[in-house]
């Protein structure tokens, strides 16, 4: 508890739960300072005008902080970049522009899998190190935001929709839409 925001060494504020920033504007060179693409396109979708949707995964590296405390070691995780789109139309970095089906459903690239890691926090003033458990984003996926649910419900994209995921805690749909931060769990 108390991890409202993470701050890395470039003073980039990674919002706490409940705060979802808009992705940075499209740039031909970088997005979130991660470059050279992500994983190859995935999640085929059977649609009349779109053969495949792609979800860009960018990685980044940072130290986690909690107030004056800082992780003893840095971590690496993925950033799920913004809007999904047909793979054949995607630029190097996904912007907010919709190039197809303006009246169609809204697709978002959001965290899919997380990996739990334990990190040690070092605090100034001789305070004892603290151990925390974090959930780092391990993969991203496209989810469809339906207009039939007041734009609030994210649905799994592709064949996974009808398959319940065993052994995983349910994640509120609204939480994942733009969140790309490590999620902390109480680990005392």
């Amino acid at each position: 508890q108390g991890w409202q925001a993470f701050r890395n060494d470039a003073t980039e504020v990674i919002p706490g739960l409940g705060e979802y920033p808009e992705p940075p504007p499209e740039n031909n060179q970088t997005m979130n300072r991660a470059e050279n693409g992500g994983r190859p396109p995935h999640h085929p979708y059977d649609a009349k005008d779109v053969s495949e949707y792609s979800c860009r995964e960018l990685h980044y590296t940072r130290f986690l902080t909690d107030g004056p405390c800082r992780s003893a070691k840095p971590v690496t995780e993925l950033v799920c970049s913004g809007q999904c789109g047909p793979a054949r139309l995607l630029p190097n970095a996904i912007g907010r522009v919709k190039w197809w089906r303006p009246n169609g459903p809204d697709f978002r690239c959001i965290p899919d899998r997380y990996r739990a890691q334990r990190v040690q926090l070092l605090c100034p003033g001789g305070a004892a190190p603290r151990s925390r458990k974090v959930r780092l984003v391990a993969s991203c996926k496209c989810k469809r935001l339906t207009r039939f649910h007041n734009q609030s419900e994210l649905k799994d994209f592709g064949p996974e929709t009808a398959r319940p995921q065993k052994g995983r805690k349910p994640r509120p749909g609204a939480r994942g839409a733009k969140a790309n931060q490590a999620e902390l769990e109480n680990a005392y």
Epitope: A34, E35, N36, G37, G38, R39, E57, L58, H59, T61, K73, P74, V75, T76, E77, L78, Y114, R115, Q117, R118, V119, L136, V137, A138
Partner: nanobody
């Protein structure tokens, strides 16, 4: 278990270039994310750049446009090409390895880079 050894550090004049090498031993090297970090005297260790097994790169603002990270999985090596060096780049440079979506748990011993004005 992956082990890392840095090399290529040294003394260089401002505006000069250096190429650091991180050599790894271990069969699973290619699956790790490799990062370069640095620590100047009296300061905290900070991120410089990192690269995934697939070649996706990340740069902190301090080295953006001047530093280039690359890797050769066949040789188990990761490189940091540093151009237009400045005195404030003086530090011990470390490479470290992390599993994807993980903590950088494996560290090299570091190589000293000194940039004189």
């Amino acid at each position: 278990e992956v082990q890392l050894v840095e090399s290529g550090g040294g003394l260089v004049q401002a505006g000069g270039s250096l190429r650091l090498t991180c050599a790894a031993s271990g069969r699973t090297f290619s699956s790790f994310v490799i990062g370069w970090f640095r620590q100047a005297p009296g300061k905290q260790r900070e991120v410089v750049a990192s690269i995934t097994s697939g070649g996706s790169t990340y740069y902190e603002d301090s080295g953006k446009g001047r530093f280039t990270i690359s890797r050769d999985n066949a040789k188990n090596r990761v490189y940091l090409q540093m151009n237009s060096l400045r005195p404030e780049d003086t530090a011990v440079y470390y490479c470290a390895a992390a599993e994807p979506a993980g903590v950088y748990d494996v560290w090299g011993q570091g190589t000293q880079v000194t940039v004189s004005s």
